[in-house]
Interface confidence: low
């Protein structure tokens, strides 16, 4: 037997760990797959990405809906030939998440 | 040339992306290296772990100080021979972070 308060605390923690969009730090260059002579300052931006736990090992926390948000960043080319340019960079922002099977099951597999 | 307001927004975002302790969802069983016949409910807990960006590619965001916090969880053994037990589980909680070289440099290496 467990007292109701302890169960409440455990349940609240569990709710907070579940698969949902979470603010995450994303490296812009690797996100956009930019060439090595182009880099961004700041190199990282904050966006929401799916994260957290699923109830079963066979499930993975994945995005079900995505929006793209624009971040103003300095795009710097090496060698530096002009003043660093302020550019709008579109980064994926997960707006919905769900625990889904790690690999989709095909009827003929 | 950039207007001062844009710079402020970019700088604030950069501050928020930097290496610091962030609330993270951690899987208890893999954290504790428990045997496959023991699992926990909830399977995950929220703790602070170092995360975020460093200014240089050669640096990695690592913990410089750690505390251990106790979480009340149900420990379940398979096959189920008794009532799930409420046990205190100690999980590492990063309290300080720093951008450090990816591999420590030894004077004799």
């Amino acid at each position: 037997f467990y007292d109701i308060e302890t169960l409440k605390v455990i349940d609240e923690e569990w709710q907070r760990t579940q698969c949902s969009p979470r603010e995450t730090c994303v490296e812009v260059a690797s996100e956009l797959g930019k060439s090595t002579n182009t880099f961004f300052k700041p190199p990282c931006v904050n966006v929401f990405r799916c994260g957290g736990c699923c109830n079963e090992e066979s499930l993975i926390c994945m995005n079900t809906s995505t929006s793209y948000i624009s971040k103003q960043l300095f795009e710097i080319s090496v060698p530096l030939t002009s003043v660093p340019e302020l550019v709008p960079v579109k980064v994926a922002n997960h707006t919905g998440c769900k625990c889904l099977p790690t690999a989709p099951r095909h009827p003929y597999s | 040339f950039y207007d001062i307001e844009t710079l402020k927004v970019i700088d604030e975002e950069w501050q928020r992306t930097q290496c610091s302790p962030r609330e993270t969802c951690v899987e208890v069983a893999s954290e504790l290296g428990k045997s496959t016949n023991t699992f926990f409910k909830p399977p995950c807990v929220n703790v602070f772990r170092c995360g975020g960006c460093c200014n240089e590619e050669s640096l990695i965001c690592m913990n410089t100080s750690t505390s251990y916090i106790s979480k009340q969880l149900f420990e379940i053994s398979v096959p189920l021979t008794s009532v799930p037990e409420l046990v205190p589980v100690k999980v590492a909680n990063h309290t300080g972070c720093k951008c450090l070289p990816t591999a420590p440099r030894h004077p004799y290496s």
């Epitope: 300052k41 660093p84 | 040339f1 950039y2 844009t6 710079l7």
Partner: antibody, heavy 117, light 112 residues
Amino acid sequence: QVTLKESGPGILQPSQTLSLTCSFSGFSLSTYGMGVGWIRQPSGKGLEWLANIWWNDDKYYNPVLRSRLTISKDTSNNQVFLKISIVDTADTATYYCVQVTNPFVFWGQGTLVTVSA
Amino acid sequence: DVVMTQTPLSLPVSLGDQASISCRSSQSLVHNNGNTYLHWYLQKPGQSPKLLIYKVTNRFSGVPDRFSGSGSGTDFTLKISRVEAEDLGVYFCSQSTHVPWTFGGGTKLEIE
């Protein structure tokens, strides 16, 4: 509130090196995208942009004067320096320090430099 | 370099009159990001220049609405609808689209 203040030698002779200091407050040169620059104005004439230095230590110079200009910064002490080598009477002007944003909003009060034999 | 040509060199006006200053650039000031970085400054005797209008038409904070900017491409105009005593001084146009950033030669607004 942003303030910038220039200081210089006042008078110097032809062929000497002019050293100017800009001391600023209200912002930091370690902030992304921030820059500080120098503009000069001969008495009763127009304005000429000389150079600026960015938060990441990149420097930009007016191509016409590039070979004679050196800009540097001391971020921790909120200072930017400009050196002009081999000065001539044509370098007599009021020298302004500016915060490089788009456009120039904050200017120093200016320091008058006279090159005279 | 982009040459900025201001006319007239001197503009005598009576208080309450309208004043108009022209600024022409030797090449288009439209940046590849779509903005036109043409600005206007006023310099009073013994002072540093103060920003009036930025990006062609935008009044800087605290600038009275009697000041207005217009134009596009290479031709720009600053208008003062009713000149007041505090408006006297030298007006400069400036471009920050192309490096090096350049200024016009100035227009002196004075009482006739």
